[in-house]
Interface confidence: medium
């Protein structure tokens, strides 16, 4: 017969031949003869084959060096490397974890969107008005500003992004003040304390 | 109060080895990693060695590596800086800080020892 | 590693002076960068954090700026207790974790 041009799936061609291709977890020994099957032999310890193959070496597994901050997350099998990840308080520089880098601190006026994890670094947020963050830090969120009223205080120093509001004690001469006419051209108003940190932010 | 009190300073021959503790107080001291601060007489501030707070990740300066081992006994409360193999050039005093986060993230350090001195001459 | 370097590393100032120390940063650091005050036989002691974050207890007189590689620390109004020496830290990479050399602050 016409010897083949091509072979079905999990076979290769030699010599005019269509072999059979070793099993995952196995490596070639010696390929397929007219009246001998392809010979296969188990990868060692330590090694692994991930696919039908007609490799002559196995592949070592991936070694997790705790000097770079690793550790086996997973161990491999005959068909399995090794899967790597970080030590606590680090993350994978790379998808394919090579090595570890620590963590990030969101810095004051940044609070953690998103804690890290063995393979992501901290991920950060801007603290949105009303909330603040005053510290560095790898797991606060933002904190929302005090609320001054129901604690019956007034505000008497705005908050930021960085700072709490400072909350003080009602008080009618300070909570109420008189705009002179200069200050309006001409016209009088009563403005209380509030309408004045909206009008200080705006 | 935190309070941080370092002991184990001393004279040493060229060599020798030598231990330190820092004992900690006013805080909880599993939760945040912990470091070892060294300044040589009329000089400046060098970093020796950091540990984390749970699980107790370790790095060293290159200066000291591999003569120099931090470990952490939290049930105790205490800080430890084992020094072998040491020479002239460690003469300094040893302060142990206390790091702002219990991981290694970039974190400054809040609160410091007293110090204590280690002679390292024959 | 990152290397600090700090400037001048000496300075004499009188009572109420205003005074300025530059750290800058052999790369970016962002705002990581924290400052100490040392007195002689003390222990540092941490002033500000995050380049510009005021510790807790410390004066207002204080005050921290900059971003990416430089960065000052301020002083605004001298006091008697301010004479002493100022560090610099870098805690961008980590570790190891670097000082400045140190900017020493004396009465004139």
């Known amino acids: 017969p016409e010897p083949p041009t091509a072979c079905r799936e999990k076979q290769y061609l030699i010599n005019s031949q269509c072999c059979s291709l070793c099993q995952p977890g196995q490596k070639l020994v010696s390929d397929c003869t007219e009246f001998t099957e392809t010979e296969c032999l188990p990868c060692g310890e330590s090694e692994f084959l991930d696919t039908w193959n007609r490799e002559t070496r196995c592949h070592q597994h991936k070694y997790c060096d705790p000097n770079l901050g690793l550790r086996v997350q997973q161990k491999g099998t005959s068909e399995t490397d090794t899967i790597c990840t970080c030590e606590e308080g680090l993350h994978c520089t790379s998808e394919s974890c090579e090595s570890c880098v620590p963590h990030r601190s969101c810095l004051p006026g940044f609070g953690v969107k998103q804690i890290a994890t063995g393979v992501s670094d901290t991920i950060c947020e801007p603290c949105p008005v009303g909330f603040f963050s005053n510290v560095s830090s790898a797991f606060e969120k933002c904190r929302p500003w005090t609320s001054c009223e129901t604690k019956d205080l007034v505000v008497q120093q705005a908050g930021t992004n960085k700072t709490d509001v400072v909350c003080g004690p009602q008080d009618r001469q300070r909570e109420q003040k008189l705009i002179s006419e200069e200050d309006l051209g001409g016209e009088q108003k009563l403005i209380s304390e509030e309408d004045l940190h909206h009008h200080h932010h705006h | 109060e935190v309070q941080l009190v370092e002991s184990g300073g001393g004279l040493v021959q060229p060599g020798g080895s030598l231990r330190l503790s820092c004992a900690a107080s006013?805080?909880?001291?599993?939760?945040?990693?912990m470091n070892w601060v060294r300044q040589a007489p009329g000089k400046g501030l060098e970093w020796v060695s950091i540990?984390?707070?749970?699980?107790?990740?370790?790095y060293y300066a290159d200066s000291v590596k591999g003569r120099f081992t931090i470990s952490r006994d939290n049930s105790k409360n205490t800080l430890y800086l084992q020094m072998n193999s040491l020479r002239g050039e460690d003469t300094a005093v040893y302060y142990c800080?206390?790091?702002?986060?219990?991981?290694?993230?970039?974190?400054?350090?809040?609160?410091w020892g007293q110090g204590t001195l280690v002679t390292v001459s024959s | 590693d990152i290397q600090m370097t700090q400037s001048p590393s000496s300075l004499s100032a009188s009572v109420g002076d205003r005074v300025t120390i530059t750290c800058r940063a052999s790369?970016?650091?962002?705002?990581?960068l924290n400052w100490y005050q040392q007195k002689p036989g003390k222990a540092p002691k941490l002033l500000i954090y995050?380049?510009?974050s005021l510790q807790s207890g410390v004066p207002s007189r204080f005050s921290g700026s900059g971003s990416g590689t430089d960065f000052t620390l301020t002083i605004s109004s001298l006091q008697p207790e301010d004479f002493a020496t100022y560090y610099c830290?870098?805690?961008?990479?980590?570790?190891?974790?670097?000082f400045g050399q140190g900017t020493r602050l004396e009465i004139k």
């Open positions: 800080a206390k790091d702002t986060e219990r991981d290694i993230t970039g974190s400054p350090f809040d609160y």
């Open positions: 006013g805080f909880t001291f599993s939760s945040y990693a």
């Open positions: 540990i984390s707070g749970t699980i107790g990740k370790t």
């Open positions: 790369q970016s650091i962002s705002s990581y």
């Open positions: 995050a380049a510009s």
């Open positions: 830290q870098q805690s961008y990479s980590t570790p190891p974790i670097t």
